[in-house]
Interface confidence: medium
């Protein structure tokens, strides 16, 4: 259970001195920003017990794991329901305070009722100021039932609940007819969910007896022990005024816990501290009885005294909760009720036991089910008490039952059975399962139907290249997700096996069966960027890119060309079948389009990054091409071209465009505007002597248009000079070897 | 060492213009894609515009395309960018970063920023 | 012009818890997807980049994954030093556009 008291100080003549404390002993609590758990909370409940709004009251933190409650100004702020909220996640717990008023007409004789499940509860309400009204009972602020003001009983007018259940717990409240609710009784009952002695789901686990008033935790069987008193069955004593789970905390002030209601997560709830009782908590026990509301009884024996805060001291030679057993006795001490080992493994088992005379090594043995009794193979003396140590032989399956640990002197005996479960470490049945695979990595659900016990603590994926004689990686996984291998080889197979652990020692399983999973072919990670594009034709346009440089075989199977056509809402796909490509001619495009223009890299089926998208608008369609062309060498640097004008032209030409390249060259071409377009011969001056050209050309009216048959022509050796009519027209600038 | 350092940015009226420069150093500048990204006060990352290795290819985002236009001047090593009809949303700190060659797609090279504010 | 969002925008956590940020693209993005932590008044630091590969000289506490349209960012184990603000960027295709960040801080 969360260590969370909440105090309440029941010295009551001035409301103003009376304050609620929230305790956490919790590792972090409360401590907010500054550390690991939420906050604590402590404030009042309206939603039961409402009182009239008055000034609004103050919280302080003194510390990191305690909060103080103050600013009452009159009695009635003080009467209804206040919670504590503390500890973190799952452990978030809380604890409430339920506060009656001293001037009510109706009074609880006890104001916390822990019940276990299917238990009659009775809440007496004891007449304080009579009134002749009936009395109105309500659960949790709603009507419940109604008694005649005479069927009080002796003062004090009875609920019966039989056979409650957990949904019964809550605010019980006993009010006189047409009296303010300021005047009842508030009770709190609070239903254990198992019968007296059980706990966990189903309720089939047994409590360990808890000692001194401890009430059993019905979801997690611990004890949670009065203020007082500590320990896993609280067997023992803190000094006094002492409390929380580890006997942390002190009461505060000159008279200890004396006037302090202390209340504790449930199933405990409220009561005084221990060695008070009474309304108030300002009287001490009676002689004979001590604890928490003085419910324990001493009944001291051989001479043992009450102390009313932890019950009988005993005098030298006697121990026992009465004093009732002699120290000539030896007693085996703390022993665990139950053990857990794993199958094979050869586990230590300890021993402790006191007496008088001492136990020494050879008297203490440990006998296992099957009646086989092992010495202890080392003893270690400390001055109250003896701890034999037992190595005990490999474990099997027929070990499992009762052990028991037994001690002898001449002062007599003394045993304690425990329980030993030999647990199977799991061994996967099946293989891990192949969720998705990328070219680097696997997705992979481990965890697969298995031999032998669980809990399943880890989760070990072993993985290595199929065929390697390599070691095998290893990853240690969470049983509940998915795991992703990664760093993978691209296009590999791998072989993949389960390992499954349990808790403790030896709890590592064999390995599973190997599966072979294998990664993707890998993505094309290099992003082109595109670096040139021009326009070959109306309906044709050569792109260029370039790929980043990087170390490494280039992973690519070819490029794909996404021209997309906004107006139409088309788009044209081109694939480059070669990853060495730079540069490709589109053709058949739709003249007078603009196109958004990317580049990818793919290998297989997957993409790699686009490129930066370009913007090309290709020219509407041009003319017809020119007719008749003819070339005529004048020289060893000039050639003349001749030609006739296009027929059916749409419109005038503008200019017209020659194209000049080496014949067999591996340069771009280059290309002349003759920007007269009247003329029918050009001559192209600056060219290489002895040298072949390729020569065709197009006219240009809003767009180029189609080009014409290419012809042939070679300029003359050096010094040779043509003969024949030359007309000028606008040649080349630069030589094309320039 | 790789360096970025943006200058040009300043405070200016709705509807005028400044150039940002980003002088570069510590790599071969010519090699790598470059981008401008910017960063209103108190407000999130937004990318603006990208221009490949030789300068020969650029991108912007829809909010300044036909305003801000990116350029390069490898010889130089600098990268630039013409802001032109600003308006109020523009201010806002611009830095510029080296693109990634391949592989490790993230901005791992970023200038400290120039301020341009835009305000009458 | 693909679209990325981020949740939650703001969150508090206390050290040592592990805190998740999630990063979602209109569409699918394969892996091209970048973490960068940014403090107040310094430039954007880069952490993840091709959605789950470490950057060098980023502690291990930092881990990315996811592929497609869902992305997460995880810090394992937070420090007070992890108060900063969180984006994420996608490279599948122009625009790189950013999500809007996650604004991380301790309570």
């Known amino acids: 259970a969360v260590d969370l008291t909440l105090l309440a100080n029941l010295r009551l003549t001035d409301p103003q001195r009376f304050f609620l404390t929230c305790v956490s002993g919790e590792a972090g609590a409360g401590r907010g920003s500054d550390a690991w758990g939420p906050p604590l909370l402590l404030e009042k409940d309206d939603r039961i017990v409402r009182t009239p709004p008055g000034p609004p009251l103050r919280l302080a933190r003194n510390g990191s794991h305690q909060v103080t409650l103050r600013g009452f100004s009159k009695p009635s702020d003080l009467v209804g329901v206040f919670s504590c909220v503390g500890g973190a996640g799952a452990r978030r717990t809380r604890v409430i305070y339920v506060h009656n008023s001293p001037g009510a007409h109706l009074l609880p004789d006890k104001v916390t009722h822990t019940v276990n499940k299917g238990d009659t509860a009775v809440l007496s309400a004891r007449v304080h100021k009579e009134k002749q009204t009936d009395v109105i009972w309500k659960s949790n602020g709603s009507y419940f039932y109604t008694l005649d003001w005479h069927e009080a009983q002796d003062g004090r007018f009875l609920l019966q609940l039989p056979n409650v259940q957990p949904p019964s717990s809550g605010i019980y409240s006993a009010t006189y007819l047409e009296a303010s609710p300021l005047g009842s009784a508030f009770f709190r009952l609070i239903v254990r969910g198992c019968g007296a002695g059980r706990w966990g789901p189903g309720c089939t686990k047994e409590c360990p007896g808890c000692l001194h008033g401890g009430v059993c935790h019905d979801h997690d069987g611990e004890c949670v022990c009065p203020p007082g008193f500590t320990g896993t069955r609280c067997e023992q004593a803190c000094r006094e005024g002492r409390f929380g789970q580890s006997c942390q905390e002190q009461c505060p002030g000159i008279s200890g816990c004396r006037g302090l209601t202390f209340c504790l997560p449930d199933p405990y709830g409220c009561s005084c501290g221990s060695g008070w009782r009474g309304s108030q908590c300002q009287e001490a026990c009676a002689p004979g009885h001590f604890g928490a509301d003085c419910r324990l009884q001493c009944q001291c024996q051989n001479g043992g005294t009450c102390d009313r805060f932890s019950g009988c001291v005993c005098p030298s030679g006697w121990h026992g909760v009465h004093c009732e057993k002699s120290d000539r006795i030896p007693q085996i001490l703390n022993m665990a009720s139950e053990l857990e080992f794993n199958l094979e493994t050869m586990p230590r088992i300890n021993c402790a036991a006191a007496g008088n005379p001492f136990p020494v090594r050879g008297s203490i043995e440990l006998r296992k089910p099957d009646g086989t009794v092992l010495l202890s193979t080392k003893a270690i003396v400390e001055p109250e008490k003896t701890t034999a140590e037992f190595e005990v032989p490999r474990l099997v399956l027929a070990d499992s039952g009762f052990w028991e640990c037994r001690v002898s002197t001449s002062g007599g005996q003394d045993s304690r059975r425990f329980k030993v479960n030999v647990k199977v470490p799991p061994v996967p049945l099946a293989a891990p399962r192949l969720l998705t695979k990328q070219s680097r990595q696997l997705v992979v659900s481990p965890l697969v139907s298995f031999s032998g016990d669980g809990p399943i603590s880890t989760v070990r994926l072993h993985y290595r290249p199929q065929d390697s004689t390599m070691d095998w990686s290893t990853i240690v996984v969470d049983p509940s997700e998915n795991v992703t291998l990664m760093n993978l080889r691209p296009k590999t197979g791998y072989s993949v096996r389960v390992q499954l652990s349990r808790p403790g020692e030896g709890g590592e399983g064999a390995w599973g069966p190997p599966t072979l999973m294998t990664t993707d072919c890998p993505e094309p990670l290099l992003q082109p960027w595109l670096e040139g594009w021009h326009v070959e034709g109306t309906d044709r346009l050569r792109v260029s890119w370039s790929l980043p440089l990087v170390p490494g075989p280039l992973v690519g199977d070819g490029f794909l060309l996404r021209l997309w056509d906004g107006t139409r809402g088309q788009e044209r796909r081109e694939n480059v079948s070669s990853p060495q490509a730079r540069t490709a001619l589109l053709t058949g495009l739709t003249p007078g389009t603009h196109y958004q223009l990317d580049v990818q890299l793919y290998h297989c089926t997957l993409l790699g990054p686009a490129s930066p998208p370009a913007h090309v608008l290709l020219p509407p369609s041009g003319p017809p091409a020119p007719r008749h062309l003819h070339a005529q060498a004048l020289s060893d640097s000039e050639i003349q071209l001749t030609w006739k004008h296009p027929e059916a032209l749409p419109g005038p030409i503008s200019k017209y465009v020659v194209e000049v390249q080496v014949a067999g060259g591996a340069g771009d071409p280059l290309w002349i505007d003759v920007d007269r377009p009247e003329e029918t011969s050009t001559i192209i001056r600056g060219l290489n002597a002895s040298t072949r050209y390729l020569f065709r050309m197009r006219a240009s009216i809003q767009g180029l248009g189609d080009w014409s048959n290419t012809v042939e022509e070679s300029t003359l050796g050096n010094g040779l000079q043509a003969e024949g009519p030359v007309q000028e027209s606008r040649a080349a600038e630069e030589g094309l070897d320039q | 060492e790789v360096q970025l350092l943006e200058s040009g940015g300043g405070l200016v009226q709705p509807g005028g213009s400044l150039r940002l420069s980003c002088a570069a150093s510590g790599f071969t500048f010519s090699m790598y894609g470059m981008v401008w990204v910017r960063q209103a006060p108190g407000k999130g990352l937004e990318w603006v515009s990208v221009?490949?290795?030789?300068?020969?290819?650029?991108g912007y985002a829809d909010s300044v395309k036909g305003r801000f236009t990116i350029s390069r001047d490898n010889s130089k090593n600098t990268l630039y960018l013409q802001v032109n009809s600003l308006r109020a949303e523009d201010t806002a700190v611009y830095y510029c970063?080296?693109?990634?060659?391949?592989?490790?797609?993230?901005?791992?090279?970023w200038g400290q920023g120039t301020l341009v504010t835009v305000s009458s | 012009d693909i679209q990325m969002t981020q949740s939650p925008l703001s969150l508090s956590a206390s050290v040592g818890d592990r805190v998740t940020i999630t990063c979602r693209a209109s569409q699918g993005i394969g892996h091209y997807l970048a973490w960068y932590q940014q403090k107040p008044g310094k430039v954007p630091k880069l952490l993840i980049y091709t959605a789950s590969t470490l950057q060098s000289g980023v502690p291990s506490r930092f881990s990315g994954s996811g592929s497609g349209t869902d992305f997460t960012l995880t810090i394992n184990s937070l420090q007070p030093e992890d108060v900063a603000t969180y984006y994420c960027q996608q490279f599948n295709s122009y625009p790189h556009t950013f999500g809007q960040g996650t604004r991380l801080d301790i309570k």
């Open positions: 221009i490949s290795p030789s300068g020969g290819n650029t």
């Open positions: 970063a080296r693109a990634p060659r391949g592989y490790s797609y993230g901005y791992y090279y």
